[in-house]
Amino acid sequence: TQNKALPENVKYGIVLDAGSSHTSLYIYKWPAEKENDTGVVHQVEECRVKGPGISKFVQKVNEIGIYLTDCMERAREVIPRSQHQETPVYLGATAGMRLLRMESEELADRVLDVVERSLSNYPFDFQGARIITGQEEGAYGWITINYLLGKFSQKTRWFSIVPYETNNQETFGALDLGGASTQVTFVPQNQTIESPDNALQFRLYGKDYNVYTHSFLCYGKDQALWQKLAKDIQVASNEILRDPCFHPGYKKVVNVSDLYKTPCTKRFEMTLPFQQFEIQGIGNYQQCHQSILELFNTSYCPYSQCAFNGIFLPPLQGDFGAFSAFYFVMKFLNLTSEKVSQEKVTEMMKKFCAQPWEEIKTSYAGVKEKYLSEYCFSGTYILSLLLQGYHFTADSWEHIHFIGKIQGSDAGWTLGYMLNLTNMIPAEQPLSTPLSHSTYV
């Protein structure tokens, strides 16, 4: 066996998305000879790691290796052995680790160090683990969906490869909702990006893009809920919190120490006369919506217009792909259809939140109660964020497309991240004419 096994004429790449609530491993595959063509990379596997996000391992770093084992073993099964040593592995950690780093750089470094050591024990080309910035998360999400939609291709097609794709080369905006942060990224129409921190310039396939992006740390759905609870408990008269964002009859005890564990609730922190409080659901969409709006400071804006908290936001332009938790939550609520208007979504949310908890548990017996209990809040939060936070209207709502996958690949930042790190998105249009997408469909 003295010859290197002939590699297949395909290549593979692995990206681990170390999010705040969980870690997912994605395996991508592409034809080796078409690396610079647009739209040739596709996802062949997603493996969700059992357990919480890596930031939760801060007191038990020795368990990280075992935590990653199943999905890394899955990668060994999916990718041919002859390709293992040439397959790059990247881990990007997002807002959960950004928050941990805010609390303690040393603890965040320790977690990443153990993650790196665990991943380098596998026979892949491990390229490192790092905390990506919110700006990167937004940018790579935007690259992913536009790459998959074929927006970077210079060939205008007469057919559509996905239902919501227009035939023009106008890029889609990207709306990403995680557990700890949310990102909005799009190309504004002839608008100066007034805040340099929110401006990105790309040259992709011979075309220049001036992109706006912002990541709102602490405004992912899980951290937004912690913020709302911390805000509302301030004015509670005792250790009972009657909460409109949970179904009538729902009860849950919350430790005050857990509430104030995250940097996201620091602004609401106060000394409370109790160590625990009980959430009692009352299931009222309108009141829940009002409570959520109090998390968005819209009274201050140093620019021509803002989203919230004094962050510049240009006028919305074009179509948007809303993915990650935007999609998962709306999919659960059966609200992802293009035909459902914003008014209809609001009506359905009102009905859903008002349903008694016992009835909800019976209707969705297969869903874990922890997740099930939070869909009323999450759905209401999504509406509040999109309408009041980002200024979508009933009319522009139809430009939001809730996307899970495009062409079999998950919408999210991981594909864009890998395309960038493997230099698979050239600045200039490749000399050889890329094949029509019909070749890959």
């Epitope: 066996t1 290197k4 024990n121």
Partner: antibody, heavy 121, light 107 residues
Amino acid sequence: EVQLVESGGGLVKPGGSLRLSCAASGFTFSKYWMNWVRQAPGKGLEWVGEIRLKSNKYGTHYAESVKGRFTISRDDSKNTLYLQMNSLKTEDTAVYYCTTQLDLYWFFDVWGQGTTVTVSS
Amino acid sequence: EIVLTQSPATLSVSPGERATLSCRASQSISDYLHWYQQKPGQSPRLLIYYASQSISGIPARFSGSGSGTDFTLTISSVEPEDFAVYFCQNGHSLPLTFGGGTKLEIK
């Protein structure tokens, strides 16, 4: 012809240091993960450690028994693998083999002839 | 660490007989198990990789089988030059480990 030739073995006192070299020829050295395996007199084989490629930032992994004392390095321009052994113990006495896998990974289809290291006072 | 246990420690056979060597792993290693032959004063030589994959230049009488935790090296008809020590090796995960060896001797 694919060949690995070890050198640098010898007699050393406990606590002393020694540096072994392995000269590779007949294959593109820089493209392959390289390993050291040792065999104590009359005993079985023991993996010492590995070094990966430049693209892997020359990542190294070691057996627990040598961690912190032994260092594997490589010089791709000289087609040479090294094993720096510090704080040597009598139990490090062994024949040290330089080895690689020219197919796939983590098995060894090419072995050197070995070099003997004796740690004794 | 994956521990490999080889049995028997010594196997006595006559030339022409079938020899069966066993290797057991402390946890499942799929088919990531390799077999080596070592003769006195020589370096080990790879015989079988990934439990059952044969190598060009190695006589067809050597075959491997097994998956998970139990593996077997079989020599269908032992030749005089086969008397040696045989080692199995975990190629699944670091640290890489070897079995203690089985000495194949003439009966």
